[in-house]
Interface confidence: medium
């Protein structure tokens, strides 16, 4: 089955610059399928823009200005790129790539979409570091004692733009855990958001990760915030040498003792 | 030009109570097009739900039912037993037939219908209230309450800033909420909640322990390290005494 990944969840540009949005195709050979690009402007319907077929033919929607969008594909990396030239305010939108995935029955095919990339246009000069800054909260003793469960909370602050994705996993597992989150809130020129995960007592002795995707993460990789295991008797901490966990680094977690 | 028009912009649904979304086609006969439904959830993920002729996306067949009503020129999507996971914007879209019956493979979308999910009407439930702290940050966690109306107060004389609470549906079909704030005196902050004409305090839930059980940490354990250095904690820490963690990146 075809699967589409758009690694950039957002792309921030200043006026008149060029934006390049990527779409990675897996599960199907890119040179044997057509890739479509759609856009969703705020408050408008999702609209087809341009496609590149398996033989390289490009088809643009009528009414789309020529020279505005360019689409190509790189079979070696199984990637299609949408290039938006001379970005202007009216290009602010979420851009989706898509492909038709044929089912195993006659006439049965579906169009699957990538997760989208939001194009943001700003005239602001922002601080050098506008990546999400994490603060973590461990379960209160009262909750673990009374409810045989514990809630981890992951607070992310001082990031720009506002587009952010947060999910939770246990260490050594790729299963995404069911979590809850607040709305993204504006604080001065940046944003904050928090997400929380409630786990049963039997899972408190496992390490958990709050995984954050943001355009301005260091090295462009997901930030992983480690929540140590909570044992009912004792825990030992064994962080690695580096302080922030981008990809394979580990965050320093400094325990502070309180009697709650 | 054809247009797909959703019946409603917003549809509130209750958990477990079937709901129907409708989308009418203007300017053409719906029979000349194949109808598709998609759902966009938080984070913009566009997921395929249904395409005419009983094609369903993974995990949708048991809880969704798509149909077209040729006579009324309508596309219909039924959510048979909504859950909190079904919240999102629902889009109808059609594949188009070009001139002379030639098939073209772009989709034409309608505007989305925002589906908001509410818990089923149920007996009132009093919340549990817990406080979590880290440095100047305090979070008040309010769990498993019904109905939704609630006021959460973080009680402090030295407020730096407070944020609006997040109120969400819990997996059990009640509500959970979290309110965050920053306070100079975070150690003394408590949380009080007004719900259903009653007040619930975080202190009501604190675990009573013997005074001998309050083991003071060694100085080294409780010292914040400079932001660029990384140290291993030197001792085993009894987690029963720990509900805070500070982070230096």
């Amino acid at each position: 089955a075809g699967h589409l990944e758009q690694p950039q969840i957002s792309s921030t540009k200043t006026l008149s610059k060029t934006a390049r949005l990527e779409c990675v195709v897996s599960g199907i050979t890119i040179s044997a399928t057509s890739v479509y690009w759609y856009r969703e402007r705020p408050g408008e319907v999702i609209q087809f823009l341009v496609s590149i077929s398996y033989d390289g033919t490009v088809r643009k929607e009528s009414g789309i200005p020529s020279g505005k969008f360019e689409v190509d594909r790189i079979p070696e990396t199984s990637t299609s790129t949408l290039t938006i030239h001379n970005v202007e305010k009216q290009d602010i939108a979420t851009y989706y790539c898509a492909l038709w995935e044929a089912q195993q029955e006659l006439g049965k095919k579906i169009k699957v979409f990538g997760p989208g990339t939001k194009l943001i246009i700003t005239d602001k000069q922002l601080d050098a570091d506008v990546s999400p800054k994490p603060t973590i909260f461990l379960p209160s003793i009262a909750e673990t004692k009374l409810q045989k469960a514990g809630t981890y909370l992951c607070l992310l602050e001082k990031f720009f733009p506002d587009v952010i994705k947060i999910h939770w996993q246990e260490k050594k597992s790729n299963t995404i855990l069911g979590s809850q989150e607040g709305n993204t809130m504006k604080t001065n020129d940046t944003y904050m958001k928090f997400s929380w995960l409630t786990v049963p007592e039997k899972s408190l002795d496992k390490e958990h990760r709050c995984i954050v995707r943001h355009e301005n993460n260091k090295n462009g990789v997901d930030q992983e915030i480690i929540f140590p295991p909570i044992k009912t008797d004792v825990i030992t901490m064994d962080p690695k040498d580096n302080c922030s966990k981008d990809a394979n680094d580990t965050l320093l977690l400094q325990l502070t003792n309180t009697s709650a | 030009a054809i247009e797909l028009v959703p019946e409603h912009q917003t549809v509130p649904v209750s958990i477990g109570v079937p709901a129907t979304l409708r989308c009418s086609m203007k300017g053409e006969a719906i029979g000349n097009y194949y109808i598709n439904w998609y759902r966009k959830t938080q984070g913009n993920t566009m997921t395929f739900i249904y395409r005419e002729k009983d094609i369903y996306g993974p995990g949708f067949k048991d809880n969704f039912q798509g149909d077209i009503d040729i006579a009324k020129n309508l596309a219909v999507l039924k959510i048979l037993a909504p859950s909190e996971r079904d919240e999102g914007s629902y889009y109808c879209a059609c594949d188009t037939l070009g001139m002379g019956g030639e098939y073209t493979d772009k989709l034409i979308f309608g505007k989305g219908t925002r589906v908001t999910v509410e818990p089923r009407s149920q007996p009132h439930t009093k919340p549990s209230v817990f406080v979590m702290k880290n440095g100047t940050n305090v979070a008040c966690l309010v769990k498993e309450f019904y109905p939704k109306d609630i006021r959460i107060n973080l009680v402090s004389s030295k407020k730096i800033t407070e944020f609006d609470p997040a109120i969400v549906i819990s997996p059990s079909g009640k509500y959970n909420a979290v309110k965050l704030g920053k306070y100079e005196d975070s150690n003394s902050v408590t949380c009080s909640v007004q719900h259903d004409n009653k007040t619930v305090h975080s202190t009501d839930f604190e675990v009573k322990t013997d005074s001998t059980d309050h083991v003071k940490p060694k100085e080294t354990e409780n010292t914040k390290q400079p932001s660029k250095s990384c140290h291993k904690p030197k001792a085993i820490v009894h987690t029963e005494k720990v509900n805070m963690m500070s982070l230096t990146v």
Partner: antibody, heavy 123, light 107 residues
Framework: QVQLQQSGPGLVKPSQTLSLTCAIS??????????WNWIRQSPSRGLEWLGG?????????NYAVSVKSRITINPDTSTNQFSLQLNSVTPADTAVYYC?????????????WGQGTMVTVSS | DIQMTQSPSFLSASVGDRVIITCRAS??????LAWYQQKPGKVPKLLIY???TLQSGVPSRFSGSGSGTEFTLTISSLQPEDFATYYC?????????FGQGTKLEIK
């Protein structure tokens, strides 16, 4: 206008292979909006859909369970036709065989039919 | 497989009569039903698709209705050329299946 022209033998011996061809004019076997089907009709079974083929950036086939182990439907883009092969036939396969176009815009209903070929399975 | 059952199997009527043929599906097929007419020694001819849409060139005295499991084909005023066998076909899920037919004869 679209037409389908069938060809193939009217008599096949038991255990042998029944082979029929359907030539398309006025449409393409690689059309994005059509499926190409084989149907048979006998007094005992009535109308019975056997299977079909269609092209949507690659070729797909779908067959009726009753004949799945014995049937092959092949498109031929060079001659713009499609064929039916039914292996290991028995007298129960005696029927009139039709090819037909299933049209996307008609929700796969069969709007164009071949003239039919009466096939008798007998030694 | 979805079973399609037509009733009646035989029907005698006169020119000018209003005739109704019923088709029942063993499970819901939404509106994905077609009706065909077949005269002796001829190929089937498509009359109606998606339960109620008339194929181009088919006289308006033919109409179809229904959805789910119950469908009807109505001929409002029988003409001499309408005496034939009529078949319904479900196109909702594979394998496509036909009804056993309704033979419409002159009374």
């Amino acid at each position: 206008q679209v037409q389908l022209q069938q060809s193939g033998p009217g008599l096949v011996k038991p255990s042998q292979t029944l082979s029929l061809t359907c030539a398309i004019s006025g449409d393409s076997v690689s059309s994005n909006s059509a499926a190409w089907n084989w149907i048979r009709q006998s007094p005992s079974r009535g109308l019975e859909w056997l299977g079909g083929t269609y092209y949507r950036s690659k070729w797909f086939n779908n067959y009726a369970v009753s004949v799945k182990s014995r049937i092959t439907i092949n498109p031929d883009t060079s001659t713009n036709q499609f064929s039916l092969q039914l292996n290991s036939v028995t007298p129960a396969d005696t029927a009139v065989y039709y090819c037909a176009r299933g049209e996307w815009g008609l929700r796969d209903a069969f709007d164009i039919w071949g003239q039919g070929t009466m096939v008798t399975v007998s030694s | 497989d979805i079973q399609m059952t037509q009733s009646p199997s035989f029907l005698s009527a006169s020119v000018g009569d209003r005739v109704i043929i019923t088709c029942r599906a063993s499970q819901g097929i939404h509106s994905y039903l077609a009706w065909y007419q077949q005269k002796p020694g001829k190929v089937p001819k498509l009359l109606i698709y998606v339960a109620s849409t008339l194929q181009s060139g088919v006289p308006s005295r033919f109409s179809g209705s229904g959805s789910g499991t119950e469908f009807t084909l109505t001929i409002s005023s029988l003409q001499p050329e309408d005496f034939a066998t009529y078949y319904c076909q479900q196109l909702n899920s594979y394998p496509w299946t036909f009804g056993q037919g309704t033979k419409l004869e002159i009374k």
